[in-house]
């Protein structure tokens, strides 16, 4: 990608925390070794990253979680990549599915996600989970972030 | 990217090579259907991707192994994704984690690994795994690499 | 990426489609959240992305499957990413495996493969699957796709 | 109920400067984009600037950039927009409006540039 | 930037009768699976109204008489049976590309 003012990188890699909220949205931090190339993509309110600049990115996510089936509902662990633009706009982009491992107290297991997708100005993406107290924030195991094509 | 002499395109993916050497950190070789781009990346003793040029890169790594959970100890499977930057400690950059299958005599399963980080020139990127034993070394199934944005 | 005439951004993105075909190769098409940057990637019969201009590519699959050990093969569900360039074999350039789940009816896992390739002017890229019967074509789960570095 | 009020019209000299406000009332201020739309006496609608929610990305119509600035401050639920070098084409009622699809507006404001 | 053109710059209908306004823009306003379509409605002396978003979805308290179709370059207001306080001036607005766009306005009359 251009480095020039026109064409900056733009980039973000930001990583799990751990929260006490009950909600299913992700939450995330600029801590340890994460990435945040400049302010054309930002991490707001720790759950979404927001982009200034309309066009191709390439988003991903990596959500490692430890179940276990007698403990968990029927339904497998779900990750899903979604899209929030201004305007009504909230759509899944990504979805990954894993049934819960028969391991005891509870097997981990890793799900990645990746694409390219257009976002447009002001256009947010976050990380939805079927269960967040699953999700396990050790070092590297749970990371989320994007690059601008 | 530019194609110039001042942004010349960096890339590489290599393939998983088995070992008899005991340590945790997978081997790779430019063979089969490898990416070396040019010499501003390198493979280095067949175990690290070490870049000459600071900037952001998405570095990746798919692993794939057979495992079974009375064969193998409680913990899981464990690949890592890690830095060595010249005069610093090596840090783990991703994480992901998979429970052994009950499958006989093995059950394989594959994990998938990738984000963006900033490199420093002389920075090395390398996979460590639980137990290099039970990786797949089948066409395809394990594999490294990074690009440049 | 430029967005100059010389060095057009090329990605695309690509939804699973089911398919009556026995075939082991997944069907694809460019609805819901797809991408198409331009004419010189294409989707060629709902199977494989084709692309007009040589370069590297970073290219992507992501399939989900719901699976059952004993209604199975003990062989795993294994998919791969393969290359078909004008004039020469296919070649498998990427390969993930897992077991089958003890769920019942079935259990889904998901899979995700990625790396960096050199393809050739008119080279085409396609995913095959053990048990295409198996993939799970809801919103999100199984895609496809690549991005010219 | 969604309310929104501007304020800081008025009469202005061409090169001058004006601070329009929006205060906002019924609904989480933060969680949404606002818009400046404009609409000069007898004529159609045109938009002027938005400005995303918590960072504070901010877009401008060709017509205003670089003289006008649009900010918001989420704990007072207001916006604004300061407008400097002030031109007789920008003559004009200002409305707010809530999110990219304009689903609520202000009443408007009118900013008058002569001489 | 992308134009937006709509058509008639006015239309007299009797009431009861369908008015039907048209709006063009000069590439199109699809992102993925929507059209980044809305329609106002201004009476004189007050601020516009959002009538339909996303070309179809009719807003919440507007009566549904009012309908949005097309996809692409080419979008339809349409006013099934016109009342008296349906008399103004409806816009179509594009937000697919910065800068947001508005068409240039077509005045409803009745016949």
């Known amino acids: 990608m251009q480095k020039g003012d026109q064409n900056p990188q733009i980039a973000a890699h930001v990583i799990s925390e751990a929260s006490s909220k009950t909600t299913s949205v992700l939450q995330w931090a600029e801590k340890g070794y994460y990435t945040m190339s400049n302010n054309l993509v930002t991490l707001e309110n720790g759950k979404q990253l927001t982009v200034k600049r309309q066009g191709l990115y390439y988003i991903y996510a990596q959500v490692t979680f430890c179940s276990n089936r007698e403990a968990s509902s029927q339904a497998p662990f779900i990750a899903s990549l979604c899209l929030k633009s201004p305007g009504r706009f909230e759509r899944i982009l990504l979805r990954a599915a894993n049934t819960h491992s028969s391991a005891k107290p509870c097997g981990q297991q890793s799900i990645h996600l990746g694409g390219v997708f257009e976002l447009q100005p002001g256009a947010s993406v976050f990380v939805n989970v079927t269960d967040p107290s699953q999700v396990s924030h050790g070092t590297g195991f749970t990371s989320f972030g994007l690059l601008k094509l | 990217m530019q194609k110039g002499d001042q942004n010349p395109q960096i890339a590489a993916h290599v393939i998983s090579e088995a070992s008899s050497k005991t340590t945790s950190v997978l081997q790779w070789a430019e063979k089969g259907y490898y990416t070396m781009s040019n010499n501003l990346v390198t493979l280095e003793n067949g175990k690290q991707l070490t870049v000459k040029r600071q900037g952001l890169y998405y570095i990746y790594a798919q692993v794939t192994f057979c495992s079974n959970r009375e064969a193998s100890s409680q913990a899981p499977f464990i690949a890592s994704l890690c830095l060595k930057s010249p005069g610093r400690f090596e840090r783990i950059l991703l994480r992901a984690a998979n429970t052994h299958s009950s499958a006989k005599p093995c059950g394989q399963q594959s994990i998938h690994l990738g984000g963006v980080f900033e490199l420093q020139p002389g920075a090395s990127v390398f996979v460590n795994v639980t137990d290099p034993s039970q990786v797949s070394h089948g066409t395809g199934f394990t594999s490294f690499g990074l690009l440049k944005l | 990426m430029q967005k100059g005439d010389q060095n057009p951004q090329i990605a695309a993105h690509v939804i699973s489609e089911a398919s009556s075909k026995t075939t082991s190769v997944l069907q694809w098409a460019e609805k819901g959240y797809y991408t198409m940057s331009n004419n010189l990637v294409t989707l060629e019969n709902g199977k494989q992305l084709t692309v007009k201009r040589q370069g590297l590519y970073y290219i992507y699959a992501q399939v989900t499957f719901c699976s059952n050990r004993e209604a199975s093969s003990q062989a795993p569900f294994i998919a791969s990413l393969c290359l078909k360039s004008p004039g020469r074999f296919e070649r498998i350039l990427l390969r993930a495996a897992n077991t089958h789940s003890s769920a019942k009816p079935c259990g889904q896992q998901s899979i995700h493969l990625g790396g960096v390739f050199e393809l050739q002017p008119g080279a085409s890229v396609f995913v095959n699957v053990t048990d295409p019967s198996q993939v799970s074509h809801g919103t999100g789960f199984t895609s496809f796709g690549l991005l010219k570095l | 109920e969604v309310q929104l009020v501007e304020s800081g019209g008025g009469l202005v000299k061409p090169g001058g400067s004006l601070r329009l406000s929006c205060a906002a009332s019924g609904f989480t201020f933060s969680d949404y984009a606002m818009s400046w739309v404009r609409q000069a006496p007898g004529k159609g609608l045109e938009w002027v600037s938005e400005?995303?929610?918590?960072?504070?990305?901010?877009y401008y119509s060709d017509a205003v950039a670089g003289r006008f600035t649009i900010s918001r401050d989420n704990a007072k639920n207001s916006l604004y927009l300061q407008m400097n070098s002030l031109r007789a084409e920008d003559t004009a009622v200002y409305y707010c409006?809530?999110?990219?699809?304009?689903?609520?507006w202000g009443q408007g404001t009118l900013v008058t540039v002569s001489s | 930037d992308i134009v937006m053109t709509q058509s008639p710059d006015s239309l007299a209908v009797s009431l009861g009768e369908r008015a039907t306004i048209n709006c063009r823009a000069s590439?199109?306003?699809?992102?993925?699976?929507?059209?980044?379509m809305q329609w106002y409605q201004q009476k004189p002396g007050q601020p516009p109204k959002l009538l339909i978003y996303a070309a179809s979805n009719l807003e919440s308290g507007v009566p549904d008489r009012f309908s949005g179709s097309g996809s692409g370059t080419d979008f339809t207001l349409t006013i099934s049976s016109l009342q008296a306080e349906d008399v103004a001036v409806y816009y179509c607005q594009q937000t697919k590309k910065l800068p947001w766009t508005f068409g240039q306005g077509t005045k409803v009359e009745i016949k």
């Open positions: 590439e199109s306003v699809e992102y993925y699976d929507t059209s980044l």
């Open positions: 400005i995303s929610t918590v960072h504070t990305y901010t």
């Open positions: 409006a809530r999110d990219r699809v304009l689903d609520y």
